[in-house]
Interface confidence: low
Amino acid sequence: EGICRNRVTNNVKDVTKLVANLPKDYMITLKYVPGMDVLPSHCWISEMVVQLSDSLTDLLDKFSNISEGLSNYSIIDKLVNIVDDLVECVKENSSKDLKKSFKSPEPRLFTPEEFFRIFNRSIDAFKDFAVASETSDCVVSSTLSPEKDSRVSVTKPFMLPPVA
Amino acid sequence: EGICRNRVTNNVKDVTKLVANLPKDYMITLKYVPGMDVLPSHCWISEMVVQLSDSLTDLLDKFSNISEGLSNYSIIDKLVNIVDDLVECVKENSSKDLKKSFKSPEPRLFTPEEFFRIFNRSIDAFKDFAVASETSDCVVSSTLSPEKDSRVSVTKPFMLPPVA
């Protein structure tokens, strides 16, 4: 079973609504872990959840807390809680083949669609992650840059296939 | 009774939720009519609603249309309809003391808080506008900059002090 799998809740489904409710040209800063689009998840997941936590916490500050219904604030607040749980879980499992990327995370700007595609990819990694099978080396070409996969459909409603 | 007053509906109340649901540092372009903060409404209202219509229509394109509940798209769509109604109404009343500003509208950048404060001021103008009393000249000092009118209420339901 995937590490920390029990920490991932169905709140992630709210991401669809959140992405639709954010301006398409609004830019979200994320320290992107180089290679997460091509390397196995054990190479980047421990750093990525920390960076996602930071970015989502910062994003939360951009909204006002209104009580009625599903607001952007309430959705992001839930996502922060999910990711913070995963950060804690990763710490608990830090000896279980979760490796540090050899390159430092780089601050990049992403549209909501791009940012939450990375978010989804990270969440999916916990669902699929099996310690025993993750033994490959974490080596990535220095020419890679994030999120340039032409296979990503932008005609789908808002969500967003996992990144290649 | 104010000109076009019957075109102003309670959908405007949704602005509270909309402003809370937009990133505080997101910038919205609006061609601002110089002097609307200090001059009587007949001097600027006819131009301002046209510019608000353009800006809101542009803003609408930044969001996806999701069916469930009050989304940003659905709120902005309602506001576009309100303002477009007012544009038509202004055309019908163009002979009724509605003057053209002597200065051309200038494209400026506003946070959601600022933009919808101007929106609110414009909507209020229709509620308060009485043709007979609006006879003053439309002259504005070149040193003025917009929205410094202490008369603009920031305690109204959705409006909102200027953002940093």
Partner: antibody, heavy 115, light 105 residues
């Protein structure tokens, strides 16, 4: 805009800067603090909305500095705690116009952090 | 991040001077230009990339959008010798360029 409160302080110490505003409706404007280390460029430090309801900070000062305002006194404040040598700079208060970024500046007040 | 060039330049009165500012990411038109003289506070010259601030001489002009921006002084005057900063304000934290010092040749 007239700043005051600068001076020499030891590392780890505290200082409170003030900025007295006049000539405009203070509560209608967001205000910011911008600093400039000796011989260096400008660095935005913090901002506060017209009502005081929203505050913003640069990462370099987050958790150490607190911006506030008293609209009844037309005064902007910057409470600086846990000061470091790298906080040494001239601190300017600036008015943030609706469109024009920082359109009015104070003359600045020098803060020196040294043992 | 905002990168200004050149970091300094020497020019004569009457010269046409151009300073460039490049943003690491697109900032549309959310850019201002400031002038600062030694021991003085900065002064706003241009906002929204190309709008001249009230009271600023018309020899100053700004252009550009996206990532590349330019400040032009059409005919340099003695009082224009100073340091010039660009600044973006698409979102906080606002960031300034490192400055361009315009000196007398």
């Amino acid at each position: 805009l007239v700043e005051s409160g600068g001076g020499l302080v030891q590392p780890g110490g505290s200082l409170r800067l003030s900025c007295a505003a006049s000539g405009f409706t203070f509560s209608s404007y967001a205000m910011s603090w911008v600093r400039q280390a000796p011989g260096k460029g400008l660095e935005w430090v913090s901002a506060i909305s017209g009502s005081g309801g929203s505050t913003y900070y640069a990462d370099s000062v987050k958790g150490r500095f607190t911006i506030s305002r008293d609209n009844s006194k037309n005064t902007l404040y910057l409470q600086m705690n846990s000061l470091r040598a790298e906080d040494t700079a001239v601190y300017y208060c600036a008015r943030r116009d609706f469109f024009a970024h920082f359109d009015v500046w104070g003359q600045g007040t020098l803060v020196t952090v040294s043992s | 991040q905002m990168t200004q060039s050149p970091s300094s330049l020497s020019a004569s009165v009457g010269d046409r001077v151009t300073i460039t500012c490049r943003a690491s990411q697109g900032i549309r038109g959310y850019l201002g230009w400031y002038q600062q003289k030694p021991g003085k506070a900065p002064k706003l010259l241009i906002y929204s990339a190309s709008s001249l601030q009230s009271g600023v001489p018309s020899r100053f002009s700004g252009s550009g959008s996206g990532t590349d921006f330019t400040l032009t002084i059409s005919s340099l005057q003695p009082e224009d010798f100073a340091t010039y900063y660009c600044a973006e304000y698409i979102r906080m934290p606002y960031t300034f360029g490192q400055g361009t010092k315009v000196e007398i040749k």
